[in-house]
């Protein structure tokens, strides 16, 4: 806590400007008006303050807004955001996507911090659902964001938001998450034609049931092995050799290299040897 001292004569800051880097901590506390700071927060980011000086500025804002900062201040926090604790952020009501972007930009290139996680949580809860624009923004900054959500949280994602999801955004999703996302993707892309539909749905197929895989096998989709290996084992097991052959097309030869790995291994064990032999790959059931 910085002790309360009177501002020396001639040192009262008329504005937030570049001269403040030469103020000692106690001078900042005594000579910078908190209300002035709040209205000129946009200037703070351009001034090379020390971490200790930023602590003083934060303290002044905390005193001015004990119930939490208004969005007009939050939007211009800049590097001061890095000084905020999750407890501070829980007091905020952030509704503007521009504010969210501005704060994510400050943390860009770093792992998702507890502060950022809290900010996103507050923002999404405030919006009521994970809409397309929000998802677009979050996955642009954190490609793994979607897969960091629980299946329960993912259930609030409207199908329309699925259009914002890129294949790399699903790289770290587990089957439980894909189980939630797949039906939404199916709904979102339902009006697309066969080949375009497959391109879009491919990343979500780890949550597809058997009947959908059977349907895809009738459409000459030529699924690659990487996608096939991510399918749910329980969805792959009921597929016939002919259906898998149609599903994979020219990629069927890749089964040989994966014969010891799930779901290929389990699927092979469920097939008649005669049927497997029709593939000519030397697969042993």
């Amino acid at each position: 806590e910085v002790e309360k001292t009177a501002c020396p004569s001639g040192k009262k800051a008329p504005e937030i400007d570049e001269s403040l880097i030469f103020y000692k901590k106690w001078e900042l506390e005594a000579c910078v008006d908190a209300a002035l700071l709040a209205t000129q927060m946009d200037r703070v980011n351009a001034i090379p303050f020390t971490y200790e000086q930023l602590d003083v500025l934060k303290h002044k804002l905390d005193e001015l807004y004990p119930q939490g900062y208004p969005e007009s201040v939050i939007q211009h926090l800049g590097y001061l955001f890095l000084k905020m604790s999750p407890e501070d952020i829980r007091k905020w009501n952030v509704t503007s996507l521009e504010t969210l972007k501005a704060l994510l930009e400050v943390n860009k290139g770093h792992e998702m911090s507890p502060q950022v996680a809290t900010l996103i949580d507050r923002f999404v809860k405030g919006r009521g659902q994970l809409d397309k624009d929000t998802l677009d923004t979050l996955t642009a900054f954190y490609p793994g964001y979607l897969c960091s959500l629980s299946p329960e949280e993912l259930s609030s994602v409207p199908p329309s938001s699925i259009w914002a999801v890129r294949p790399q955004d699903l790289d770290t999703c587990d089957p439980r998450q894909l189980d939630v996302l797949y039906p939404k993707a199916r709904l979102a892309f339902q009006n697309m034609n066969g080949s375009e539909y497959f391109v879009k749905i491919q990343s979500f197929l780890g949550g597809a049931p058997t009947e959908d895989l059977k349907a895809l096998s009738q459409q000459n989709v030529s699924m690659d092995l990487a996608t096939f290996m991510k399918l749910r084992t329980d969805a792959v097991l009921p597929l016939t050799v002919a259906e898998v052959q149609k599903l994979l097309g020219p990629h069927v030869e890749g089964l040989k290299a994966e014969e010891r790995h799930r779901p290929v291994r389990d699927w092979i064990l469920r097939q008649r040897q005669d049927d497997l032999d029709t593939l000519g790959l030397g697969l042993q059931g």
Partner: antibody
Framework: QVQLKESGPGLVAPSQSLSITCTVS????????ISWVRQPPGKGLEWLGV???????NYNSALKSRLSISKDNSKSQVFLKMNSLQTDDTARFYC??????????????WGQGTSVTVSS | DVVMTQTPLSLPVSLGDQASISCRSS???????????LHWYLQKPGQSPKLLIY???NRFSGVPDRFSGSGSGTDFTLKISRVETEDLGVYFC?????????FGSGTKLEIK
């Protein structure tokens, strides 16, 4: 382009005060600070003071009591006032732009200076 | 106030030679924000000073690469790799880490 131009009286009587104006163009005083520097004949540079973008000032410790810097952003002018001049205040007075953004407080552009002689 | 001490006061050189000017400060010029606000200026005869190097080692626009700055803390050096006629004049170091800002006393670069 960036320009700074000082205008002063040239000659000042001892014990009188000096007023110099620095008129700038090519940039705004609300975005850049201005320093005043003087140079006695054949000597080195002496920093007098600075006026920051917000209007705050800092001064040379030894001359603080005699100096006052102010500005008029709308007219793009900065003013230096120095009281109680003596003959050893004879010098060339420069105004210079402090670039705190890209150049981190260095003085990147200087005026041509105005010569001030203190003599009766 | 921070005192800036420059050596030598005068530096006679032959054209094409390397020149080295030293600047020492009475206290560290590392600001609490991590930056070191040490700058070099050149004043040619009859002209205003001009910025050469800012923040220890960054050349200002238009400054030839034969000029280089180095140093840290309290000890700094300006080097001119091959002196040319247009380099003659008085070189000043200056600090803007602490207010009041201060200049060194100057080093006159002249022909031997």
């Amino acid at each position: 382009q960036v320009q700074l131009k000082e205008s002063g009286p040239g000659l000042v009587a001892p014990s009188q005060s000096l007023s110099i104006t620095c008129t700038v163009s090519g940039f705004s005083l609300s975005s850049y600070a201005i320093s005043w520097v003087r140079q006695p004949p054949g000597k080195g540079l002496e920093w007098l003071g600075v006026i920051w973008t917000g209007g705050g000032t800092n001064y040379n410790s030894a001359l603080k009591s005699r100096l006052s810097i102010s500005k008029d952003n709308s007219k793009s002018q900065v003013f230096l006032k120095m009281n109680s001049l003596q003959t050893d205040d004879t010098a060339r007075f420069y105004c210079a732009r402090n670039n705190y953004g890209r150049l981190d407080y260095a003085m990147d552009y200087w005026g041509q200076g105005t010569s001030v002689t203190v003599s009766s | 106030d921070v005192v800036m001490t420059q050596t030598p006061l005068s530096l006679p050189v032959s054209l094409g030679d390397q020149a080295s000017i030293s600047c020492r400060s009475s206290q560290s010029l590392v600001h609490g924000n991590g930056n070191t606000y040490l700058h070099w200026y050149l004043q040619k005869p009859g002209q205003s000073p001009k910025l050469l190097i800012y923040k220890v080692s960054n050349r200002f626009s238009g400054v030839p690469d034969r000029f280089s700055g180095s140093g840290s803390g309290t000890d700094f050096t300006l080097k001119i790799s091959r002196v040319e006629t247009e380099d003659l004049g008085v070189y000043f170091c200056s600090q803007s880490t602490h207010v009041p800002f201060t200049f060194g006393s100057g080093t006159k670069l002249e022909i031997k």
